[in-house]
């Protein structure tokens, strides 16, 4: 059960993924790639990333916007198409044997809504986080990292609302 | 053109170590993950170990953990497998395989092979 | 981990007939799917990845379909130099694994 992003075609898509490298500044390769995650390495490779930078993009459609060398490697998809839509594999090439950290997140794109009425704050903080609005309920264990946000403050909630509009996103717990 | 060429086969006894190696030529060496397949005389294929582009994660069989050890030096374009405390049932052809395009967890290039013989 | 059964173990054909192979997983490995060509004294040749994408100067006789656990190699007319073993391998769960093989013999 993977974590649901949704962004409308046209739109930039925001797929989070994150990790704390240890020490600071001591990075680790990481790949993101369409399907979920296999054995090893990525599937369908769209963005790859070595010690240093991103190395290899097989579109420039696919970013890395975030702080990459604080361990932030969520990724960017810009104008995204209904082709777009599917899982994605995010994979944190933690060194040694088998310690691979993996992440599978869902992107639903849509069409956009012919008419759209201004959202209400309301609105837009239930679609942003369904389940933890109404609910208070997290996503499911496994997809904690780097899906769904626990013990989220107002002034986050307001930052990342933001964030998503900006992207065009939104999310969702499957 | 891609190739790749085992070495290091032979005749060892039972608790020996062997070290193979395999010399990748004709692709960007250090782009692709690279594993080590190998397959009993009249059996079938047995994935045995394999090894991210970089050289940091690895990746392993459950017979063959904590004996063998997979390693690359892209710096060499070499792929190398160190095998200890082999056993009569290691026997096997060993290929060197390359890792799809895109990160495929697929063999799209093998090399031809090095016939291991465990007995005493 | 996930079992891979081929069927038939062995299929007896004539060149320009058609070929069917099964592969069977004993869990989903969605579309991780490979077929491998392995003839005496060689190593295997990819022909299938990703369950239907054919591999780099594969002839177009040859194609795969299937997702989830029931996965199909097909050679729609055979030729002499199609009689070999089959393989597939799944990479959807850790560790990789093969399936036993299906022998294409000439009738």
């Known amino acids: 059960s993977e974590v649901e992003y949704i962004a409308e075609v046209g739109q930039n898509a925001y797929l989070p993924c994150s990790y704390t490298p240890a020490p600071p500044g001591n990075l680790v390769p990481v790949c993101w790639g369409k399907g979920a995650c296999p054995v090893f390495d990525c599937s369908n490779v769209v963005l790859r990333t070595d010690n240093r930078d991103v190395n290899d993009r097989t579109s420039g459609r696919y970013w890395l916007k975030g702080d990459f060398h604080k361990g932030d490697v969520s990724l960017t998809i810009e104008n995204v198409t209904l082709a777009d839509s599917g899982v994605y594999c995010c994979r944190i090439q933690i060194p040694g044997i088998m310690n691979d950290e993996k992440h599978n997140v869902k992107l639903v794109v849509i069409k956009p809504a012919k008419v759209t009425p201004a959202p209400t704050l309301q609105r837009d903080l239930t679609s942003a986080f369904p389940r933890m609005l109404t609910t208070g309920e997290h996503g499911p264990a496994e997809t904690q990292t780097p899906g769904s946000l626990p013990d989220v403050n107002l002034t986050q909630i307001f930052t990342l609302t933001n964030e998503l509009r900006d992207s065009g996103a939104t999310i969702r717990t499957a | 053109e891609v190739q790749l060429v085992e070495s290091g086969g032979g005749l060892v006894q039972p608790r020996g170590s062997l070290r193979l190696s395999c010399a990748a030529s004709?692709?960007?060496?250090?782009?692709?993950?690279m594993s080590w397949v190998r397959q009993a005389p009249g059996k079938g294929l047995e994935w045995v170990s394999a090894?991210?582009?970089?050289?940091?994660?690895?990746y392993y069989a459950d017979s063959v953990k904590g004996r063998f050890t997979i390693s690359r030096d892209n710096s060499k374009n070499t792929l190398y497998l160190q095998m200890n405390s082999l056993r009569a049932e290691d026997t096997a052809v060993y290929y060197c395989?390359?890792?799809?395009?895109?990160?495929?967890?697929?063999?799209?290039?093998w090399g031809q092979g090095t016939l291991v013989t465990v007995s005493s | 981990e996930i079992v891979l059964t081929q069927s038939p173990g062995t299929l007896s054909l004539s060149p320009g007939e058609r070929a069917t192979l099964s592969c069977r997983a004993s869990?989903?490995?969605?579309?991780?799917l490979a077929w491998y060509q392995q003839k005496p004294g060689q190593a295997p040749r990819l022909l299938i990845y990703?369950?239907?994408s054919r591999a780099t100067g594969i002839p177009d006789r040859f194609s795969g379909s299937g997702s989830g656990t029931d996965f199909t190699l097909t050679i729609s007319r055979l030729e002499p130099e199609d009689f070999a073993v089959y393989y597939c391998?799944?990479?959807?769960?850790?560790?990789?694994?093969f399936g036993g093989g299906t022998k294409v013999e000439i009738k």
């Open positions: 391998q799944q990479y959807g769960s850790s560790p990789l694994t």
């Open positions: 395989a390359k890792g799809g395009d895109y990160g495929g967890n697929y063999f799209d290039y």
């Open positions: 990703d369950a239907s």
């Open positions: 869990q989903s490995v969605s579309s991780y």
């Open positions: 004709g692709f960007t060496f250090s782009s692709y993950a």
């Open positions: 090894i991210s582009g970089s050289g940091g994660s690895t």
